[in-house]
Interface confidence: medium
């Protein structure tokens, strides 16, 4: 068999939410991969599994199943969103997401994720992690092509 | 290392008010929650109230309400709870914990507070 | 208000085996960021809690493996892989999802 390509493209969105009682932030992150089948049969996506994290916690985790088949030779673009919460200890973040005064509120996020492919009863996991900024003082929609400069080489922890 | 410091066993008469202290060291004081936590003896644990010492805001468990104040001071790196009109119900163990790294995930070794005519 | 439910005792157990503590929450810990904040504290006697577990699973900083945790969004079991004399006091497990935060009455762990 030929490789199965996984390649993470990078954050597509992410919608903000506050609770102030709370000093709570709901970040809903929609982030985007690309799959490749260099194959010449086609291949099942069963199942991709997600997690973020910030300062080494994980704020979320999401799990989608039965995804998509790709074809023979076929590329396939898959959004998949992870609900995220930024409280408790890390409370200290509510202000600096919601303080006026601040115009960028870019936090470095981890995202890691999992894809998991079948083919003729084979399975086979391929993972990835990347170093995001993400906004959490607004919602945002990023290009892809800004995908670049969203990539953190060097995150500060 | 974090540590968190309360002061002294308090013996109170009924009707009085009485301040506990919790001195915080080895982090940033003004980033982390303090909650007070309630032991009676031989008891379990009661969650009071939080307060956020970075702004001071608070939040209080309604069967608290009135009997706890929580105040926090950034310069000294203490914070405070006020426990006021005393009465045998509140004769406890006080403890102070906070939020750093985790959830009540250091706590203050306790105060014992009685209250006796 | 999330109420913790805790049996008060544990069954006895051997030093050396293994023992198990229960918890039961009154709704559903598990968020829809697919975290549960269940917590899992010990008092030994004479001293203040410390935590052991955090988000149902996760041991926290210093604890030995020994211990261990899992469940449901509402059930929830502590296990103590081998009982050491150290190990004796008071589990109690809350719950960290809502405000108030709640705690479990406590289950006092015995040693026959």
């Known amino acids: 068999p030929r490789s199965i390509e996984v390649k993470y493209i990078g954050v597509k969105s992410a919608y903000v939410s506050y609770d102030a009682e709370k000093r709570t932030i709901y970040l809903n992150i929609t982030n985007t991969l690309n799959i490749t089948n260099n194959n010449y049969y086609s291949v099942e996506v069963e199942n991709i599994t997600a997690q973020v994290q910030f300062s080494k916690t994980v704020i979320g985790k999401a799990r989608l199943n039965n995804i998509t088949n790709i074809g023979p030779l076929d590329m396939k673009q898959i959004d998949y969103t992870v609900p995220t919460v930024i409280a408790e200890e890390m409370s200290y973040m509510y202000d600096f997401c919601t303080l006026l005064s601040i115009k960028v509120h870019n936090i470095v996020l981890m995202m890691q994720v999992t894809v998991t492919t079948a083919y003729f009863g084979h399975s086979e996991q391929i993972s990835q992690e990347r170093y995001q900024y993400v906004d959490c003082g607004r919602n945002t929609t990023y290009q892809l092509a800004q995908s670049e400069y969203l990539n953190v080489l060097q995150p500060q922890q | 290392q974090v540590q968190l410091r309360q002061s002294g066993a308090e013996l109170v008469r009924p009707g009085a008010s009485v301040k506990l202290s919790c001195k915080a060291s080895?982090?940033?004081?003004?980033?982390?929650?303090i909650n007070w936590v309630k032991q009676r003896p031989g008891q379990g644990l009661e969650w009071i109230a939080r307060i956020y010492p970075g702004s001071g805001y608070t939040y209080y468990n309604e069967k608290f309400k009135g009997k706890a104040t929580l105040t926090a001071e950034g310069s000294s790196n203490t914070a405070y709870m006020q426990l006021s009109s005393l009465t045998s119900e509140d004769s406890a163990v006080y403890f102070c914990a906070n939020h750093y790294t985790n959830p009540f995930a250091y706590w203050g070794q306790g105060t014992l507070v009685t209250v006796s005519a | 208000d999330i109420v913790m439910t805790q049996a008060a005792f544990s069954n006895p157990v051997t030093l050396g085996t293994s023992a198990s503590i229960s918890c039961r929450s009154s709704k559903s810990l598990l968020h829809y960021n697919g975290i549960t904040y269940l917590y899992w504290y010990l008092q030994k006697p004479g001293q203040s809690p410390q935590l052991l577990i955090y988000q149902m699973s996760n041991l926290a900083s210093g604890v030995p493996d020994r211990f261990s945790s899992s469940g449901s969004g509402t059930d929830f079991t502590l296990r103590i892989s081998r009982v050491e004399a150290e190990d004796v006091g008071v589990y109690y497990c809350?719950?960290?999802?809502?405000?108030?935060?709640?705690f479990g009455g406590g289950t006092k762990l015995e040693i026959k």
């Open positions: 809350a719950q960290n999802l809502e405000l108030p935060y709640t």
């Open positions: 080895g982090y940033t004081f003004t980033d982390y929650y």
